[in-house]
Interface confidence: medium
Amino acid sequence: QDVSLLASDSEPLKCFSRTFEDLTCFWDEEEAAPSGTYQLLYAYPREKPRACPLSSQSMPHFGTRYVCQFPDQEEVRLFFPLHLWVKNVFLNQTRTQRVLFVDSVGLPAPPSIIKAMGGSQPGELQISWEEPAPEISDFLRYELRYGPRDPKNSTGPTVIQLIATETCCPALQRPHSASALDQSPCAQPTMPWQDGPKQTSPSREASALTAEGGSCLISGLQPGNSYWLQLRSEPDGISLGGSWGSWSLPVTVDLPGDAVALGLQCFTLDLKNVTCQWQQQDHASSQGFFYHSRARCCPRDRYPIWENCEEEEKTNPGLQTPQFSRCHFKSRNDSIIHILVEVTTAPGTVHSYLGSPFWIHQAVRLPTPNLHWREISSGHLELEWQHPSSWAAQETCYQLRYTGEGHQDWKVLEPPLGARGGTLELRPRSRYRLQLRARLNGPTYQGPWSSWSDPTRVETATETAW
């Protein structure tokens, strides 16, 4: 197989080095020749020629292949011209010759993938590998080949991507800094707690890929899918040169699903304790796990230890809403929080679902606000509410919804950020229900919506005749 990798080498005498401490040279002869016919001689400048011990192997339909492996590491020297020539001993003739630099004929053995597992975000995959010759790993670049493992379609799309070793994996940005909040003050960003539509994943060809030494992070994969992957390496062409080696044996990995599918929502009320909840699946049990990470970059060869999230009793606040599983844990404000939910179905199959990582200050849930009103004139209401958290008044936004009695549809209003009240024009002689909810959405704190306040019933007065 390695011979085929050297096919583009037009030299009759082909040579390669796996680790730059070894050298193998070979050539093919169509005609069979008696043992001892050929000698492979080599010499560095100003040194006496030496013979390299030859072995031969019969090549069906091709004749004989003669192979020499340099016997001593001390004989394999870099950045220095090595003269090689094949001599027919009986005819005292040079059959073929070449001059090469060992540092330019690298053909690295494939790395062995030692771990492949989901990364810290849905659709991410972290892999680690072991380099057969670790001392040269700084001078190699890597290429990854992967594709979806689909038993029904063995010719699924394959992606080949060069691993960019100079970048660590993407920093876990604080999602949605102030600049992301320009539209409406309460525009719902895609947050770990968002129970909204799944974002479309980037096309596989655009999958981001980064590496750090012997580990690499791929993103943009489809959560919940299975993938196969292979790795190969090539000298970087700066210090050491050569060709791409062969691909490693394929490994397969099952990516966790996206916990958005379970409606995962995590929040804190006190910036100390975090509660997570997700929809309970039919005929299945589930368990939440968490871990904290300080690393903004991919930790090399470090795999998280997931801790149990302490279960709470199942809640079923209303018949229409699905039953939720809840759990809670103590958190820290100096690290990123990662959540995993494992769902075990009746036959005992375990499905994992990964939440998007978040900081505790991005998951602050406010208490339900209190709504007060008074009618100034017929149908003209003045509304007032207390900020549930005075410490973040300027970062609190509200939604007010109302509906006429007997109506199912709600009208939703968004007062300006930080407002403490407002006015509302309603039809006279009508009955309404009003509700208010709040959430943090500023540069310091963000979080999910509070629950809606208890419905406030309003009956507007008859029009006053002037």
Partner: antibody, heavy 128, light 108 residues
Framework: QVQLVQSGAEVKKPGSSVKVSCKAS????????ISWVRQAPGQGLEWMGQ?????????WLAARANSRVTITADESTSTAYMELSSLRSEDTAVYYC????????????????????WGQGTTVTVSS | EIVLTQSPGTLSLSPGERATLSCRAS???????LAWYQQKPGQAPRLLIY???SRATGIPDRFSGSGSGTDFTLTISRLEPEDFAVYYC?????????FGQGTKVEIK
Amino acid sequence: QVQLVQSGAEVKKPGSSVKVSCKASGGTFSSYAISWVRQAPGQGLEWMGQLIEGPTLRQWLAARANSRVTITADESTSTAYMELSSLRSEDTAVYYCARLPIEGPTLRQWLAARAPVWGQGTTVTVSS
Amino acid sequence: EIVLTQSPGTLSLSPGERATLSCRASQSVSSSYLAWYQQKPGQAPRLLIYGASSRATGIPDRFSGSGSGTDFTLTISRLEPEDFAVYYCQQYGSSPWTFGQGTKVEIK
């Protein structure tokens, strides 16, 4: 981390000899070359020669200095020496020893000495 | 012997500016064996870059090296007051080892 420590300043008469030492700490001499470089006042850097430690000691000298320079080493003390004879006033310079990879190193030799390391310099003044 | 020619001889720049120093070899040099040094008056040369592009220990990342074959470049992305000095390139892949004549980077 290899460090090279050189002997102190010397003042010499024309026609005499000077022997400058360069001691390696934190590593042995094998696997790399000790080069000698000099810099006359206000001038650039001039390579004088090197001693290559390996299976056999090999001395390489720049053509200009050839006959007057001798480079030796004492492996037991990890010290290299550069002796310059028949001193002239134009030999007044700062003499540096530098550890560099050998020519045609094995991979391990190259990895051990990829980054050059220099001594602090020895000032030699030749004056009557 | 391989002759290294540095250009320009003198570079007059202000702090904060970008400096680009060139080193041209009379024949091909292995990238693994090209180094850049900084030297200030009365001091030994200080290794900045080895192997054409690898930064030596403790060298700030405003210094970067590039190039291969016969053309090599040292770039200082933003000159700091302490960067004004003489810079030498050196090849140590082929005996005799040789140095460029130096480029002086001075304050404008």
